[in-house]
């Protein structure tokens, strides 16, 4: 019988008392085969973290700073359930730390030196740890003691709770630095008042502070937010302009064998019976013998944290950077205006080899990081382990939802001004063998299908989106008799046709021979009835252009396209017979890396791009003998995006809507995790 006990960790007598009450009340409402509570008392949150890591306890609720400690080795805990605030319809699990300024003050984030600052309090998250952590490497050396470095960075401050004797500049704007509401500039509202009164130039608060203190929109319009990319935005655009997105209060558990499903089952049932306005005799979100015991009194309920989400992703790159800077106190030696090497994310073994050769030739400009799937690469870019990669439009969508931005687009047509002219896109097509003359778009049911990979544009999002509109369900593996769609569940019929050996079967990388455009076409040639690829795939792999044994004798004339009106056309007539226009692949990165990635990639393509004529004797960035490694092999150049510099603008309204419609069929664990952070 599986042990269905969750050992909750309590950090005080009062918490232990509430925990016992929680245990007893849960016993009375949950059947004997359901989850139960046991209580473990420890002296501190850090002791609780250690106890959970050592399997002496299972769960505890922590503030963001402690979630970071819990994630660090050797603890390796992960967030499993989040408290939410506000309403069930619009649950708030995060707040945003922001830098507020007056509209006419005219400076940016990188010009804060010498300004006057207003803080909620020394050591507090939004008011101190996050802004000072992010500014840490700009502080004058020596950076220890930190208060002295901050005092020398700003021309004057109000940082309540600071030592006014040792660091008088930190109390210059609020004499005495009082650590309570007796100090008019203490806390969120106080820090904002410090700005409003004209004492300071910038206030470090949370996004709701402005709304709580200024009910009138006209008054709010006198203020702006400083963004990390050295721009400003209106105060209601805090989701796109903040210092960090911070989780409010989170239940953590072990990463391995952590009982996360059981913890959720317990808490979900607990909120049903003892949540807000549910029961008189025991209330989960109430602390008669104290404040915020086990859970925050202001919480309204719980939400399950998506399983793909580790602590780094949950806390977010900015927050982790800020806290790591404060804790570790290390800064790069290079001046910050110089670009560090770009860490390119390579998918599995084959891309890594090409990336390595690029790295050797780039003379220190490119480093390589490996991951097994595109989603793992996106996650690495999000958390700073990698910086950039080129993605199919379907993954540009996921990366965009995860906060990454497109920076350059692959262009596939030769033109005089290639780098300045991003193209409209390529065509997604359905290819069949000419010999299967009865096959049309309208009778694909029961046929064998070949896809580039799940989540990619031409191979999945476009054809499956069109199919979904027809069949109104997501069971594509029942629609086709079998197929190869790398990235599908291994036991799915859409992995049956794949050719990878052992663990590589159906993997969404080049270890699966039927992965990508060339792979999907190979799948059609060898086993399938229809392949969903791009309009250039057939000509690129026929007529001897692909020397591989399976392709060297193929003839373009032996293949045809399926048109949406039920007719068929020759391959060269793709302009009048395609499923949709697809956005070109694009390079994505984090916002903070955008300028450097742009600069370094433009240098790299001038050295190793299409201008290199002999790829047998030179490194060529856009060649890998039909394998599309790192970039599509038909890339002519990487083009500037001009104003199409967000994922929505880049992909276009129509495509974003199409992928959005297919979201209900999504198996992307990363997309689920990212939409949890930003619904």
């Amino acid at each position: 019988v599986p042990d269905k006990t969750v050992r909750w960790c309590a950090v005080s007598e009062h918490e232990a008392t509430k925990c016992q009450s929680f245990r007893d009340h849960m016993k009375s409402v949950i059947p004997s085969d359901g989850p139960s509570v046991a209580c473990v008392k420890k002296a501190s949150y850090l002791d609780c973290i250690r106890a959970i890591a050592a399997n002496e306890a299972d769960a505890v609720t922590l503030d963001a700073g402690l979630v970071y400690d819990a994630y660090l080795a050797p603890n390796n805990l992960k967030p499993v359930v989040a408290e939410f605030y506000g309403s069930k319809e619009d649950p708030q699990t995060f707040y945003y730390a922001v830098a507020v300024v007056k509209k006419d003050s005219g400076f940016q984030m990188n010009q804060l030196r010498g300004k006057k600052s207003c803080h909620t309090g020394l050591g507090r998250s939004a008011g101190w740890n996050i802004p000072i952590g992010l500014l840490y490497c700009d502080l004058p050396e020596p950076r220890k003691p930190l208060e002295k470095a901050v005092a020398n960075f700003f021309s004057g401050s109000c940082a309540p709770c600071a030592d006014g004797t040792d660091f008088p500049q930190l109390c210059q704007l609020c004499p005495g630095c009082g650590c309570s509401t007796l100090n008019q500039y203490f806390g969120y509202s106080g820090a904002f008042k410090c700005l409003k009164d004209g004492a300071g130039d910038v206030a470090f608060v949370k996004h709701s502070t402005i709304f709580e203190n200024l009910a009138n929109k006209a008054d709010r319009d006198q203020y702006e937010l400083l963004c990390l990319d050295n721009t400003r935005k209106p105060v209601d655009e805090y989701k796109d302009c903040h210092l960090a997105q911070v989780p409010s209060h989170t239940v953590v558990a072990r990463s391995m064998g952590g009982k996360e499903d059981l913890i959720w089952e317990l808490l979900n049932q607990a909120q049903e019976h003892f949540g807000k306005d549910k029961s008189k005799e025991f209330q989960l979100f109430s602390s008669p013998h104290g404040k915020d015991l086990l859970f925050k009194d202001s919480a309204h309920g719980f939400l399950k944290v998506p399983p793909r989400m580790d602590a780094k992703m949950y806390l977010g790159y900015e927050y982790v950077t800020a806290i790591r800077n404060l804790r570790e106190g290390t800064c790069p030696e290079a001046p910050t205006d110089e670009c560090k090497p770009v860490k390119w994310c390579a998918l599995s073994h084959h891309e890594r080899l090409k990336c390595d050769e690029w790295s050797v030739n780039s003379v220190g400009k490119i480093e390589c990081v490996s991951a097994e799937t595109t989603e793992d690469c996106i996650a690495k870019i999000m958390n700073g382990e990698a910086d950039a990669m080129s993605l199919d439009g379907g993954f540009v969508y996921i990366a965009g939802k995860c906060g990454l931005v497109p920076v350059l687009a692959e262009n596939y047509n030769k033109s005089d001004n290639c780098e300045d002219t991003p193209e409209a896109g390529y065509f997604a097509i359905a290819v069949v063998k000419k010999s299967a003359s009865d096959l049309t778009w309208d009778n694909l049911k029961g046929k064998k299908s070949c896809h580039t990979a799940v989540g990619r544009t031409a191979g999945w999002n476009i054809p499956m989106g069109l199919l979904y509109n027809k069949i109104n369900h997501c069971r594509f593996d029942e629609f086709f008799s079998e197929g190869c769609a790398p990235g599908s569940k291994k036991d799915s019929s859409l992995c049956k046709l794949c050719m990878g050996s052992g663990l590589n079967l159906c993997e969404p990388n080049n270890k699966e021979g039927y992965y990508g455009y060339t792979g999907a076409f190979r799948c059609l040639v060898e086993k399938g009835d229809v392949a969903f690829v791009k309009h250039q795939t057939v000509p690129q792999n026929t007529g001897g252009k692909n020397p591989d044994p399976w392709a060297k004798n193929l003839n373009e004339k032996d293949y045809e396209l399926l048109c949406l009106d039920g007719t068929r056309k020759p391959v060269e007539e793709y302009a009048n017979c395609h499923l949709a226009r697809a956005p070109n692949h694009a390079v994505v990165t984090r916002k903070d890396k955008e300028a450097c990635v742009h600069k370094i990639l433009r240098q790299q393509q001038h050295l190793f791009g299409s201008n290199v004529t002999d790829c047998s004797g030179n490194f060529c960035l856009f060649r890998s003998e039909t394998k599309d490694l790192l970039f599509r092999d038909d890339t002519v150049c990487l083009a500037k995006l001009h104003d199409r510099n967000t994922y929505e603008k880049y992909l276009g309204e129509e495509y974003v809507k199409a992928v959005g419609n297919l979201r209900k069929c999504s198996t992307s664990s990363l997309l689920e995790a990212c939409t949890f952070r930003r619904p």
Epitope: E351, V360, N361, G617, R623
Partner: nanobody, 117 residues
Framework: EVQLVESGGGLVQPGGSLRLSCAAS????????MAWYRQAPGKGLELVAG???????KYADSVKGRFTISRDNSKNTLYLQMNSLRAEDTAVYYC???????????WGQGTLVTVSS
């Protein structure tokens, strides 16, 4: 296609030195990039050092300052001078000229380096 054969491996004590050679069956003068990789037991392949035709080099962080890659185009040979060897340098070492354009699943037999006291 040029064939590459690695040699020079062996058993050496920590702190010792070895020089690996990679002999090519044809001219390497026109080869853009050559590199040494290694595979430790139970681990994946990792780039140890690479060199371009023009002589620019790159090293893995773990070997910087200890290993030196060089090529002698007149002898059609790639070298890896390994000094201050450590136990964690134990691996099979392979050379590549990237001529199979990255998707080679074929590597030579390699040369085994064992660092142990």
């Amino acid at each position: 296609e040029v064939q590459l054969v690695e040699s020079g491996g062996g058993l050496v004590q920590p702190g010792g030195s070895l020089r690996l050679s990679c002999a090519a069956s044809g001219s390497i003068a026109s080869i853009a990039t050559m590199a040494w990789y290694r595979q430790a037991p139970g681990k994946g392949l990792e780039l140890v050092a690479g060199i371009t035709r023009g002589g620019s080099t790159k090293y893995a962080d773990s070997v910087k300052g200890r290993f030196t890659i060089s090529r002698d185009n007149s002898k059609n040979t790639l070298y890896l001078q390994m000094n201050s060897l450590r136990a964690e340098d134990t691996a099979v070492y392979y050379c590549t000229d990237y001529s199979r354009k990255y998707y080679q699943d074929y590597w030579g037999q390699g040369t085994l380096v064992t660092v142990s006291s």
